[in-house]
């Protein structure tokens, strides 16, 4: 691996000195270091109109090192590059530039977006969601009994979160109203509300539903006869059918 030619003749530098500072093996008053001690990197720094040789343990920012058999040398990266593998390939750009395939760009190409954390151009990632789960059982106030009209919910997972320019994620849960054959709650299922009604000695025939957290503002206060209630429910059902024709489901959505 020996060099076929030695380093350029030192005769060009009349005051070459062996008593050098800071890692230099040989130096001159005018040009600083001319060669370095073993394992140190030689770098030429431009100071005004002249170039000064300096010996460092590693190449400074904006330079890359080559370990030749006879000299470890630092070479300048391209002007917009902070760290590079060689002249052709930057690995970290200077502030205000984005890295893309070894090059530093002031903006990312079409179809890519800037990652302001890594300062690289990256592919746009769109949101990906799983299939919907089956609808949950029809419920009201966390119970599956003691009512006729409740809500059912279905959910889905986010499989891939989007990048900054990617499509936003769709809703991850959906809720709709549902109607079931009313069934009485067994003793264990009866909540506080049922006990309160007993305490108030309300009409035995009353089969009023407990209110839905999603569509009522509190407990219904009027007391109706079974016939009145059935008429009212029939009317509500007709209204609901008409509304459902227009809009298949009412969605209460959570977006991630």
């Amino acid at each position: 691996q020996n060099a076929s030619r030695g380093r350029r003749q030192r005769r060009m530098h009349p005051n070459v000195s062996q008593g050098c500072q800071g890692g230099c093996a040989t130096c001159s008053d005018y040009n600083g270091c001319l060669s370095c001690k073993p394992r140190l990197f030689f770098v030429l720094e431009r100071i005004g109109m002249k170039q000064i040789g300096v010996c460092l343990s590693s190449c400074p920012s904006g330079y890359y090192g080559t370990r030749y058999p006879d000299i470890n040398k630092c070479t300048k990266c391209k002007v917009d590059c902070d760290t590079c593998f060689n002249k052709n390939f930057c690995t970290k750009c200077k502030s205000g530039f984005y890295l893309h395939l070894g090059k530093c760009l002031d903006s990312c190409p079409e179809g890519l977006e800037a990652n302001n954390h890594t300062m690289e151009c990256v592919s746009i990632v769109h949101c990906e969601a799983s299939e919907w789960s089956p609808w949950s059982p029809c419920m009201k106030k966390g119970k599956t009994c003691g009512f006729k009209r409740g809500t059912e919910t279905r959910v889905r997972d986010i499989l891939q979160h989007p990048s900054a320019k990617g499509n936003l994620c769709p809703p991850t849960s959906e809720t709709r109203t549902c109607i079931v054959q009313r069934k009485k709650c067994s003793k264990g299922e009866r909540g506080k509300k049922g006990r309160e009604r007993k305490r108030k000695k309300l009409n035995k025939e009353e089969r009023k539903e407990t209110s839905s957290s999603s569509d009522s503002k509190g407990l219904e206060s009027s007391i109706e006869t079974p016939d009145q209630q059935e008429n009212k429910e029939r009317q509500q059902q007709q209204k609901r059918r008409a509304r459902d024709k227009q809009q298949k489901s009412v969605s209460v959505s959570t977006v991630h």
Partner: antibody, heavy 116, light 107 residues
Framework: EVQLVESGGGLVQPGRSLKLSCAAS????????MAWVRQAPKKGLEWVAT????????YFGDSVRGRFTVSRDNTKSTLYLQMDSLRSEDTATYYC?????????WGQGVMVTVSS | DIQMTQSPASLSASLGETVSIECLVS??????FVWYQQKSGKSPQLLIY???RLQDGVPSRFSGSGSGTRFSLRISGMQPEDEAEYFC?????????FGAGTKLELK
């Protein structure tokens, strides 16, 4: 578009000489260290020699040191490899490449056969 | 000189299969490491530099990893055009040295 075109290969007897040339275009030739890498038939890659960008220093692989010399003409963007005292084990495809730690650009290669 | 031990020497993969090639280096070279691809009858082409960075035009199914003394090249989903010989090289110091190569064939 970067192009490296080798020439000068052929059949040569052991002990004789041959000079390969490589014409470069599409990049700033004088900015790059240039190298020769060879590949014997059905074998791997072997670095032969590198000459630095300004032609002031050159380095050689153990197997060719003392027999091969490398030179360049930056005004013509041309790289040369002078091969003397050729041996049968020098039989290979010789590639001209731009050498900057990695071998970034490659020529199509030129075949050198050393045989009696 | 730095020694490069590349394995396997040859490899046969089905279409869509994921393949890995490994290169062990005799001393710590940080990430000063390169992979080349050489298709039959063609010159080698730079594939990956600085151990993991893809050269322009290289499909994203190729990836490089490793640092220090152990490096690998991975092809996630073998394609017919990936049939080639792959070489590793250390770019840490002179003389530049190459692995012996891995011949990748399509099953």
């Amino acid at each position: 578009e970067v192009q490296l075109v080798e020439s000068g290969g052929g059949l040569v007897q052991p002990g004789r000489s041959l000079k390969l040339s490589c014409a470069a275009s599409g990049f700033t030739f004088s900015d790059y260290d240039m190298a020769w890498v060879r590949q014997a038939p059905k074998k791997g890659l072997e670095w032969v020699a590198t000459i630095i960008y300004d032609g002031s220093r050159a380095y050689f692989g153990d197997s060719v040191r003392g027999r091969f010399t490398v030179s360049r003409d930056n005004t013509k963007s041309t790289l040369y490899l002078q091969m003397d005292s050729l041996r049968s084990e020098d039989t290979a495809t010789y590639y001209c490449t731009a050498h900057d730690r990695s071998f970034d650009y490659w020529g199509q290669g030129v075949m050198v056969t050393v045989s009696s | 000189d730095i020694q490069m031990t590349q394995s396997p020497a040859s490899l046969s993969a089905s279409l869509g299969e994921t393949v890995s090639i490994e290169c062990l280096v005799s001393e710590d070279i940080s990430n000063d490491f390169v992979w080349y691809q050489q298709k039959s009858g063609k010159s080698p082409q730079l594939l990956i530099y600085a151990a993991s960075r893809l050269q322009d035009g290289v499909p994203s199914r190729f990836s490089g990893s490793g640092s220090g003394t152990r490096f690998s090249l991975r092809i996630s989903g073998m394609q017919p055009e990936d049939e080639a010989e792959y070489f590793c090289q250390q770019s840490y110091k002179y003389p530049p040295t190459f692995g012996a190569g891995t011949k990748l064939e399509l099953k």
